[in-house]
C-alpha cells in the first residue's frame, strides 16, 4: 500500500487501530463529472437481457433506499423479440459499502457494512455440463 | 419516511441537524447471505458484452481499490464469436457510496461521497435516430 | 393479509372485448408483478400474461395479439382486457401475485396468492 | 409451448398412507447457472383458487405442512405426501415457471377411497 505521511490538522483519536470508529461527515459530495451524460436510464429495456428495478428500503440503512435489478427471463431476448433459451441472462452484481445504525435507531452512529446488490442483467453463453 | 424512535443508548452528538458528522465503525460486517451463491466471476468473459475490469486505486478514498469495468467492443458478440455492430456494449453504471479523507491524508476523519462505477456491459439494441 | 378480488362482467358476447379489473391489498404494488391465469369449466390452468412492478408486460403467445395488462397504481388495481373473444374465451379468470424473493436477481413467475377467480361466459 | 404431463390424472387415496404424483417437462427445467429447476407445485381445493405448495422443485412455501416435498432434475419431478390427511383433496398441478409462456400440467385429482 501507499503510505501517506498524517496531516498535523487531522482531528484527534484515541485509537488509531484497525477495526476503528471515525468521524464522517455525511455532506455527500457529489464527484459524477460524467462526460457521458445519459446514463443507465433505459438499457434496462433495450437490453437482450431486459431486468426491473425493485425498490429496497430499509430506514436502518444508509443509504435507506437500494434499488435491486432481477432478470425478466432466464434467456435472453433475440432478434425478433423473443426468449432465446440457447442463450442465459444472469444478474450483474456488486459489492457496495452502506452504513448501518449501531446501536439500532442512532441517529448518528453506524457501522459500515457491505452489501452483494444486483445492478442489471448481461446475456452470457451457457456453461455446458458435459455427462460423464 | 418512517420515523424510527431513538434509542436511548446512542452515543451523544452535538449537532443533530444534516449535513452532520457522525461515528462509524469501519469493522465492515458482511451481510452477503446470498440465495445465488454463483457470483458474476466469469460473467465479464462469457457475456455478448464482453469488458475488462481496471483497477482504480486511490489511498485518499475507503474503498482504496474499485474495480472499473470497460466494454470491449462498441458491438455486442454474435452466435459465430463476431462483433455484430448492429447492436451495442454499454455499460451499467451505478452511483456508490466511499469514504474520501478529509481533511487529506487523515486515518480518522472522512467526508461521504458519491461516485459513479461502471459495474459491467449489456447489449443493447441500439436507438435509431430517424434523419427528417 | 394479501388479498386479490377479481371483478368484471359474468357474460360477455362474441366478438366483444372482456374486461376485468383486480384489486390488490396487502402488499405492495412497487416490488411485486401480476398474473393473470385462466381455467376453462372442467379443464387445467393457462397463463396469460403479467405484469411487472414497472409497468412493463409480457404476454403469452397465444393471446398476444388480443390482450392488453395494465396497472392503476392510485387504486391497486390492475386490469386485463381480451378483445374478440369466443366461446373458447369462457373461463373463471384469476389473477395472482408473482412471488418476490430477497436476494434472488430473477423475476418469477409462479404464483403464492390468487384471487378467488371470476367466471366469465362468452355467448349470445 | 412446453408440455407439462401429470400421471396418474386420479389418485384415490387412504388417510395416514402416503402418495406420489409425477409431473413430466418436454424439455429440461435445469438452469445451468445456478442449477435450480424451475418446477412449482400447487393444490386447488374444491371450490377455491390454487394456492402454491412448493417452488424450485423442492422449496415449501411458507406455512405448507412438511407432509408435502418435491424432488427431481431436469424434466422428471415428483410430488410426495408423506401421510395423506382428509384436507389434501383436491387437484394438485405442476407448473413450469422457465420458459414463456409459463405453463401448467393438466391435474391430478386425489380424492379420498
Known amino acids: 500500500g501507499i503510505t501517506i505521511p498524517r496531516n498535523p490538522g487531522c482531528p484527534n483519536s484515541e485509537d488509531k487501530n484497525f477495526p476503528r470508529t471515525v468521524m464522517v461527515n455525511l455532506n455527500i459530495h457529489n464527484r459524477n463529472t460524467n462526460t457521458n451524460p445519459k446514463r443507465s436510464s433505459d438499457y434496462y429495456n433495450r437490453s437482450t437481457s431486459p431486468w426491473n428495478l425493485h425498490r429496497n428500503e430499509d430506514p436502518e440503512r444508509y443509504p435507506s433506499v437500494i434499488w435491486e435489478a432481477k432478470c425478466r427471463h432466464l434467456g435472453c431476448i433475440n432478434a425478433d423479440g423473443n426468449v432465446d433459451y440457447h442463450m442465459n441472462s444472469v444478474p450483474i452484481q456488486q459489492e457496495i459499502l452502506v452504513l448501518r445504525r449501531e446501536p439500532p435507531h442512532c441517529p448518528n452512529s453506524f457501522r459500515l457494512e457491505k452489501i452483494l446488490v444486483s445492478v442489471g442483467c448481461t446475456c452470457v453463453t451457457p456453461i455446458v455440463h458435459h455427462v460423464a | 419516511g418512517i420515523t424510527i424512535p431513538r434509542n436511548p443508548g446512542c452515543p451523544n452528538s452535538e449537532d443533530k441537524n444534516f449535513p452532520r458528522t457522525v461515528m462509524v465503525n469501519l469493522n465492515i460486517h458482511n451481510r452477503n447471505t446470498n440465495t445465488n451463491p454463483k457470483r458474476s466471476s466469469d460473467y465479464y468473459n462469457r457475456s455478448t458484452s464482453p469488458w475488462n475490469l481496471h483497477r482504480n486505486e486511490d489511498p485518499e478514498r475507503y474503498p482504496s481499490v474499485i474495480w472499473e469495468a470497460k466494454c470491449r467492443h462498441l458491438g455486442c458478440i454474435n452466435a459465430d464469436g463476431n462483433v455484430d455492430y448492429h447492436m451495442n456494449s454499454v455499460p451499467i453504471q451505478q452511483e456508490i457510496l466511499v469514504l474520501r479523507r478529509e481533511p487529506p491524508h487523515c486515518p480518522n476523519s472522512f467526508r461521504l461521497e458519491k461516485i459513479l462505477v461502471s459495474v459491467g456491459c449489456t447489449c443493447v439494441t441500439p436507438i435509431v435516430h430517424h434523419v427528417a | 393479509q394479501v388479498q386479490l378480488q377479481e371483478s368484471g362482467p359474468g357474460l360477455v358476447k362474441p366478438s366483444e372485448t372482456l374486461s376485468l379489473t383486480c384489486t390488490v391489498s396487502?402488499?405492495?404494488?412497487?416490488?411485486?408483478?401480476v398474473s393473470w391465469i385462466r381455467q376453462p369449466p372442467g379443464k387445467g390452468l393457462e397463463w396469460i400474461g403479467i405484469?411487472?412492478?414497472?409497468?412493463?408486460?409480457d404476454y403469452n403467445s397465444a393471446f398476444k395479439s388480443r390482450v392488453t395488462i395494465s396497472v392503476d397504481t392510485s387504486k391497486n388495481q390492475f386490469s386485463l382486457k381480451l378483445s374478440s373473444v369466443t366461446a373458447a374465451d369462457t373461463a373463471v379468470y384469476y389473477c395472482?401475485?408473482?412471488?418476490?424473493?430477497?436476494?434472488?436477481?430473477?423475476?418469477?413467475?409462479?404464483?403464492?396468492?390468487w384471487g378467488q377467480g371470476t367466471l366469465v361466459t362468452v355467448s349470445s | 409451448d412446453i408440455v407439462m404431463t401429470q400421471s396418474p390424472l386420479s389418485l384415490p387415496v387412504t388417510p395416514g398412507e402416503p402418495a406420489s404424483i409425477s409431473c413430466k417437462s418436454s424439455?429440461?427445467?435445469?438452469?445451468?447457472?445456478?442449477?435450480?429447476?424451475?418446477l412449482a407445485w400447487y393444490l386447488q381445493k374444491p371450490g377455491q383458487s390454487p394456492q402454491l405448495l412448493i417452488y424450485?422443485?423442492?422449496t415449501r412455501q411458507s406455512g405448507v405442512p412438511d407432509r408435502f416435498s418435491g424432488s427431481g432434475s431436469g424434466t422428471d419431478f415428483t410430488l410426495k405426501i408423506s401421510r395423506v390427511e382428509a384436507e389434501d383433496v383436491g387437484v394438485y398441478y405442476c407448473?413450469?415457471?422457465?420458459?414463456?409462456?409459463?405453463?401448467f400440467g393438466q391435474g391430478t385429482k386425489v380424492e379420498i377411497k
Open positions: 395472482a401475485r408473482n412471488a418476490y424473493i430477497t436476494d434472488y436477481y430473477y423475476e418469477n413467475y409462479f404464483m403464492d396468492a
Open positions: 396487502g402488499f405492495s404494488l412497487p416490488s411485486h408483478s
Open positions: 405484469i411487472w412492478n414497472n409497468g412493463g408486460t
Open positions: 424439455q429440461s427445467l435445469l438452469f445451468s447457472e445456478n442449477q435450480k429447476n424451475y
Open positions: 424450485w422443485t423442492s
Open positions: 407448473q413450469q415457471s422457465y420458459y414463456t409462456p409459463y405453463t
